[in-house]
Interface confidence: low
């Protein structure tokens, strides 16, 4: 195969819920023609599956391929360079992809005013690719977690946390006016897997939402 | 390579002026978030500031608000800390965070992915 190529320097997957990309940094004065070679492995099942023979991006969508993730026991992944007819030796990720290393996510954060209370639903993820009977909920059945963070505007970035355990949260603003913004970092309480914070909602409180009781 | 280099840190008595830099690798400096923590001896690592790359918005926490100021310089893949009116308790080593794929405002040190080695901060009174 003539001069051998180097090996892709790291392999490693980013994976929120039903959304699984392989990454991989790209090897050192690669030519135009340079391209990569994927293959996937799958736990229980000990042989290599070519995924892709040439990929010219640093990352490749493997969650069509690894739908039973939430019911196996995990996947690993390997890439090497590929330039004519030279190869690279195969870069293996160097932990299991299982159900762990799934970052938490929510859909959204859905907020609205109710006598001076923000009250607040958080919608799960729902994926295109998940099978149908593959949600959240059903997947990550018990101790669902949310934290919750509350900035008031103006306010100068002055923070309020919250832990809740349910989809549902209200928020006592005491009898302030002004925006507030919202954002939720998901967990559950028997797993270790990281959560991402949620893009920030906000919604105004005005005088006209409070109700003036003697 | 991904990496954050800081430097700046010494010793300084109270109420002097100090500026932290810390230098990111490219691929680092395109992240959303940068920040500066600190940690002192058996304390957690707290959050001071966090900037905003892409706008520039900042955040600090309450014990340094009016004291302490976070920057970027683009051009140079730069964060700055400036840091005024010092006290003793901000005596700590400080280290500058990036991460690369959240949208947190929250000073959290486990939502910062990549972290510098830290340059330490006397403060004598």
């Known amino acids: 195969h003539g001069t051998e190529l180097p090996s892709p320097p790291s392999v490693w997957f980013e994976a929120e819920f039903f959304h699984h990309i392989l990454h991989w940094t790209p090897i050192p004065n690669q030519s135009e023609s340079t391209c990569y070679e994927v293959a996937l492995l799958r736990y229980g099942i000990e042989s290599w599956n070519s995924i892709s023979n040439c990929s010219q991006t640093l990352s490749y969508d493997l969650t069509a391929v690894t739908l039973d993730l939430y019911h196996s026991n995990g996947y690993r992944a390997r890439v090497r360079a590929v330039d004519g007819s030279r190869h690279s030796n195969w870069t293996v990720t160097n932990t299991r992809f299982s159900v762990d290393e799934v970052t938490l996510t929510v859909g959204s954060v859905n907020l609205e005013i109710h006598n001076g209370f923000i009250l607040g639903k958080i919608q799960l993820p729902r994926p295109k690719m998940a099978p149908a009977n593959d949600t959240y909920e059903s997947i990550f059945s018990h101790f669902r977690e949310y934290e919750i963070a509350i900035r008031k505007v103006p306010g100068n970035f002055t923070f309020t946390h919250k832990k809740v355990k349910h989809e549902n949260f209200s928020l006592l603003t005491s009898g302030e006016v002004g925006e507030f913004c919202v954002q939720v970092k998901p967990s559950v309480a028997s797993r270790s897997n990281k959560g991402m914070w949620s893009k920030e909602e906000c919604i105004s409180l005005t005088r006209q939402y409070f109700t003036v009781t003697n | 390579q991904v990496q954050l280099q800081e430097s700046g840190g010494g010793s300084i008595q109270a109420g002097g002026s100090l500026r932290l830099s810390c230098v990111a690798s490219r691929y680092l400096y395109s992240t959303n978030y940068m920040a500066w923590f600190r940690q002192s001896p058996g304390k957690e690592r707290e959050a001071v500031a966090v900037?905003?790359?892409?706008?520039?918005?900042?955040l600090y926490t309450d014990s340094v608000k009016g004291r302490f100021t976070i920057s970027q310089d683009n051009a140079k893949m730069t964060v700055y800390l400036q840091m005024n009116r010092l006290k003793s308790e901000d005596t700590a080593m400080y280290y500058c965070?990036?991460?690369?794929?959240?949208?947190?405002?929250?000073?959290?040190?486990?939502?910062?992915?990549?972290w510098g080695q830290g340059t330490q901060v006397t403060v004598s009174s």
């Open positions: 900037i905003y790359t892409a706008s520039g918005a900042t």
């Open positions: 965070a990036a991460v690369r794929k959240t949208d947190s405002y929250l000073f959290d040190a486990q939502s910062f992915t990549y």
